[in-house]
């Protein structure tokens, strides 16, 4: 799965007034081989202003922004659609401190995936959003190749195959 | 194999680059590390390239030293030098382990000389 | 920066004996060391990783141990040939950034 397909998520603000920010995904292939058309229009759509985020049952709040921890396992991709389905998306980390409270709250030791991958086009790691990752901020472990994507482990950043199955975190 | 080369005799303050060629290695895979060494002292770390083309620095590197790659060589520049930069420059590939780093196999070195 | 403290910075034995090299680290790098020989003339060479686990050909007369900040290197049954001088580096890294300093290395002499 290329996030590169299209932009996932443009909210400005934490709002989502204007259709025209907007870009579709187009179809996401999924392991199984159905398709689904899933609009950036729709993961906005239940998010409210940053300071006023009200989180769903079962979803953390932290800085604005609410965060699920599942407790099943799946590959990167069926993780990616399981957030967009739910409206919401992988888990993006901006900073050192949003790093600081996933560690927090992850309770196991195993890997854990979260919303960045390699993309052979851009040869970049690139978060569902679409923007590239910052090396001065974060430092991944491991190839960076086709079929890389990215899951966290205690305070560290790892390169696996997309196709492992592991938990995933859910934000919006 | 990792192979240095370009090391020679410089004049304070010039720039020089020196050159790892790396063979049978992908770099998407390893990461390659400089590491230094004056005459008569201990090792010392510069910085590495990861496997998606960032470069990393010791604190004391930063701002002078500059790695880069190309497919099959990553590149060492050197600006400012001193006679303190004299050492010979190690390239050196880690082992690809999935969660620990550490460096398995070294070139020879290539000496420079301020 | 984490930095490395080795010590001590020469150490003489006779063939045959032990010989232990210490490390200490200025912060907590779990178990994330290894060790190095290095002999004149030559690039180093790995010895231990992982702070305990020996590298693939490397005799079991090297032994490495600790965890946190303090780190040992054991050498017994020592050999003329293990005289070299031994470094070990950190290997820590966190989601922000790797810290791979050397200790200032152990001159290791056999009688």
């Known amino acids: 799965l290329l996030v590169s397909q299209g932009v996932l998520l443009k909210c400005q603000k934490g709002s989502c007034s204007n259709a025209t920010q907007y870009e579709d995904t187009g179809d996401l292939k999924v392991n199984n081989g159905t398709r689904r058309n899933i609009s950036n229009k729709d993961l906005c759509a239940s998010r409210s202003a940053d300071q006023t985020v009200l989180c769903q049952s079962e979803w953390l709040k932290y800085q604005g922004k609410c965060y699920w921890f599942s407790n099943e396992m799946k590959s990167w991709s069926d993780s990616y659609v399981y957030c967009l389905e739910r409206k919401s998306h992988l888990l993006i980390i901006h900073d050192q401190l949003e790093m600081a409270f996933i560690q927090k709250n992850l309770r196991q030791l195993n890997y854990v995936w979260i919303g960045l991958n390699f993309t052979s086009l851009k040869m970049t790691w690139t978060w569902v959003d679409g923007s590239p990752i910052d090396s001065k901020i974060f430092f991944i472990k491991g190839p960076a190749k086709e079929n890389s994507c990215a899951a966290i482990k205690e305070s560290k950043i790892f390169s696996e195959t997309c196709s492992s199955v592991f938990k995933w975190i859910c934000q919006y | 194999s990792l192979e240095e080369s370009g090391g020679r005799l410089v004049k304070p303050d010039e720039t020089l680059t020196i050159t790892c060629t790396v063979s049978?290695?992908?770099?998407?895979?390893?990461?390659i590390s400089w590491v230094r060494q004056a005459p008569g002292e201990g090792l010392e770390y510069i910085g590495f390239?990861?496997?998606?083309?960032s470069a990393y620095y010791a604190t004391w590197a930063k701002g002078r030293f500059t790695i880069s790659r190309t497919s099959a060589t990553v590149d060492l520049k050197m600006t400012s030098l001193t006679t303190e930069d004299t050492a010979t420059y190690f390239c050196?590939?880690?082992?690809?382990?999935?969660?620990?780093?550490?460096?398995?196999?070294w070139g020879q070195g290539t000496l420079v000389t301020v | 920066d984490i930095v490395m403290t080795q010590t001590p910075a020469s150490v003489s034995a006779a063939a045959g004996g032990t010989v232990t090299i210490n490390c200490q680290a200025s912060?907590?790098?779990?178990?994330?060391l290894s060790w190095y020989q290095q002999k004149s003339g030559q690039p180093p060479k790995l010895l231990i990783y992982?702070?305990?686990n020996l590298e693939s050909g490397v005799p079991s007369r090297f032994k490495g141990s600790g965890s946190g900040t303090d780190f040992t290197l054991t050498i017994s049954d020592l050999e003329c040939a293990d005289g070299a001088t031994y470094y070990c580096?950190?290997?820590?890294?966190?989601?922000?950034?790797?810290?791979?300093?050397f200790g200032g290395g152990t001159e290791v002499v056999v009688k």
């Open positions: 580096q950190s290997n820590y890294y966190d989601s922000s950034s790797p810290d791979f300093a």
């Open positions: 050196a590939r880690d082992a690809g382990h999935r969660y620990l780093f550490y460096f398995k196999l």
């Open positions: 992982g702070a305990s």
């Open positions: 912060q907590s790098i779990s178990n994330e």
């Open positions: 390239i990861n496997t998606d083309g």
């Open positions: 049978g290695i992908d770099l998407s895979s390893y990461i």
